[in-house]
């Protein structure tokens, strides 16, 4: 913690200005007053100070809003946010996209994904769900932020605001998340024809469920690898060898270059040697001919 | 074929909690959405909300701070549980299976359980 | 939240007739719009999909038209088992919706 001193009369600050890039720390501490700063927090990011300047006026400001910043002051930020912990975020209450805009742009190129994920939360809190504004907003200051988000925080999309949403945004999303955009996805497309439905829904399948994918299977739509390595494995475990290689097309072949990662190896271990054997692709590793599969999961549902 | 079973207590005094179980049996309850349904007596019908496998939920805006859906994939269930209850929520309780296929894409039913009637009464 | 309205509450008609039951969506529903019967004590049974489509095993007397705001569920010759109570439901946006039902009786 910076000392507490009392500031020289000649040092005394009646504004925010660049004369304070000559103020040692102690006297920033002792001799600017903190509802001064808040007041004109504009003019700070014009003003050249060095990182342990700003961790003063950071102090200030917390000393002075305890309980968070209000947004008059979160929106003039600037570099300051570089300074800012989840903690520190967490208390904001964020509702301006003009706040959020000025924020990602000062975080480019820092490593500041925990701080970002945190705001970006915080504005979804303030502004009650996740409006279209709001995934613009993302898409275009903050590619892949939108998987920063809790699958919590993602249920409050509503289906009318994925088609605004990229492939490339989905690109970090986890399988929980997915889980919550992909019905959503499927919801919001559901009116167009075929081929047009699957290009949109390619990149949410990863959180389809198994009769999705058997669907998919029966409208060639010819699937690339990517995406189906993309797909949960609980989803591609009960296809079979010819629905795998319906939806696969003419990419079926790229299953012998994946046949050792997930979800293609547990795929192989569950079918017979013999229909694994009709792809022509050399697929080891399937139940041998003669023996009987007994799939317990469900008998333990019965009994 | 698949089949659905809805169980839990008839009687439910007001201000509690209602809890419902459905048990899936016949085929695995990771492949499908599966929903709450219920219908008061002689009224019409309400969806509930429903949850993925994954635990991944989606509930009614009306009920939605009352209402907890969960999964059990270990015993192929599903449950609900519905706070605060009152008199107005005395129904017949039902769990469905939605159809779930892009080739038809829909949220709608294509399977149901025999429903469970629940009434709210001290 | 849309709402679905069905007409007429109640519908009387002789077996072997044409029964006609409407359902009006309050916003557009597209084609998102499936018909359930009810009979006493059991739960909907799935009838049609997509407006027009009939589910798997239900019969051809069952037809559905319409798209938009404005449904219709047609049963060209009544027979005793089709007297119950009819919901069409959209999924055209969350929360899913149920009409109130037409109940349909023996004239």
């Known amino acids: 913690d910076v000392e507490r001193t009392t500031c020289p009369p000649e040092k005394e600050v009646h504004e925010i200005d660049e004369s304070l890039i000559f103020y040692k720390k102690r006297e920033l501490e002792a001799c600017v007053d903190a509802a001064l700063l808040a007041a004109q927090m504009d003019r700070v990011d014009a003003i050249p100070f060095t990182y342990e300047q700003l961790d003063v006026l950071k102090h200030k400001l917390d000393e002075l809003y305890p309980q968070g910043y209000p947004e008059s002051v979160i929106r003039h930020l600037g570099h300051l946010f570089l300074k800012m912990s989840p903690e520190d975020i967490r208390k904001w209450n964020v509702t301006s996209l003009e706040t959020l805009k000025a924020l990602l742009k000062v975080s480019k190129g820092h490593e500041m994904s925990a701080q970002v994920a945190t705001l970006i939360d915080r504005v979804v809190v303030g502004r009650g769900q996740l409006d279209k504004d709001t995934v613009d907003t993302l898409t275009a200051f903050c590619p892949g932020c939108l998987c920063s988000l809790s699958p919590e925080r993602l249920s409050s999309v509503p289906p009318s605001v994925i088609g605004a949403v990229r492939p490339q945004d989905l690109d970090t999303c986890g399988p929980r998340q997915l889980d919550v955009l992909y019905p959503k996805a499927r919801l919001a497309f559901q009116n167009m024809s075929g081929s047009e439905y699957f290009v949109k829904i390619r990149p949410f399948l990863g959180g389809a469920p198994t009769e999705d994918v058997k669907a998919l299977s029966q409208q060639n739509v010819s699937m690339d690898l990517a995406t189906f390595m993309k797909l949960r494995r609980e989803a591609v475990l009960p296809l079979t060898v010819a629905e795998v290689q319906k939806l696969l097309g003419p990419h079926v072949e790229g299953l012998k270059v994946e046949e050792q990662h997930s979800p293609v190896r547990d795929w192989i271990l569950k079918q017979r040697q013999d229909d694994l054997d009709t792809l022509g692709l050399g697929l080891q590793g399937g139940i041998p001919n003669g023996y009987l599969i007994l799939d317990l999961s469900v008998r333990e549902a019965l009994s | 074929q698949v089949q659905l079973q809805e169980s839990g207590p008839g009687l439910v005094k007001p201000s509690e909690t209602l809890s419902l179980t459905c048990t899936v049996s016949g085929g695995s309850i990771q492949n499908y959405y599966w929903s709450w349904v219920r219908q008061p007596p002689g009224k019409g019908l309400e969806w509930i909300g429903y949850?993925?496998?994954?635990?991944?939920?989606n509930a009614n805006p009306s009920l939605k701070s009352r209402v907890i859906i969960s999964v059990d994939t270990s015993k192929n269930q599903f449950s609900l549980k519905l706070s605060s209850v009152t008199a107005a929520d005395t129904a017949v309780y039902y769990c469905?299976?939605?159809?779930?296929?892009?080739?038809?894409?829909?949220?709608?039913?294509?399977?149901w359980g025999r429903g469970t009637l629940v009434t709210v009464s001290s | 939240e849309i709402v679905m309205t069905q007409s007429p509450a109640t519908l009387s008609v002789s077996p072997g007739e044409r029964a006609t039951l409407s359902c009006r969506a309050s916003?557009?529903?597209?084609?998102?719009l499936a018909w359930y019967q009810q009979k006493p004590g059991q739960a909907p049974r799935l009838l049609i999909y997509g407006a027009s489509t009939r589910a798997t095993g239900i019969p051809a007397r069952f037809s559905g038209s319409g798209s938009g705001t404005e449904f219709t569920l047609t049963i060209s010759s009544l027979q005793s088992e089709d007297f119950a109570v009819y919901y069409c439901q959209q999924y055209n946006n969350w929360p899913l919706t149920f009409g109130q039902g037409t109940r349909l009786e023996i004239k």
């Open positions: 469905a299976r939605e159809v779930g296929r892009i080739a038809v894409a829909g949220w709608f039913f294509d399977l």
């Open positions: 949850i993925f496998y994954s635990g991944s939920t």
């Open positions: 916003q557009s529903v597209n084609a998102n």
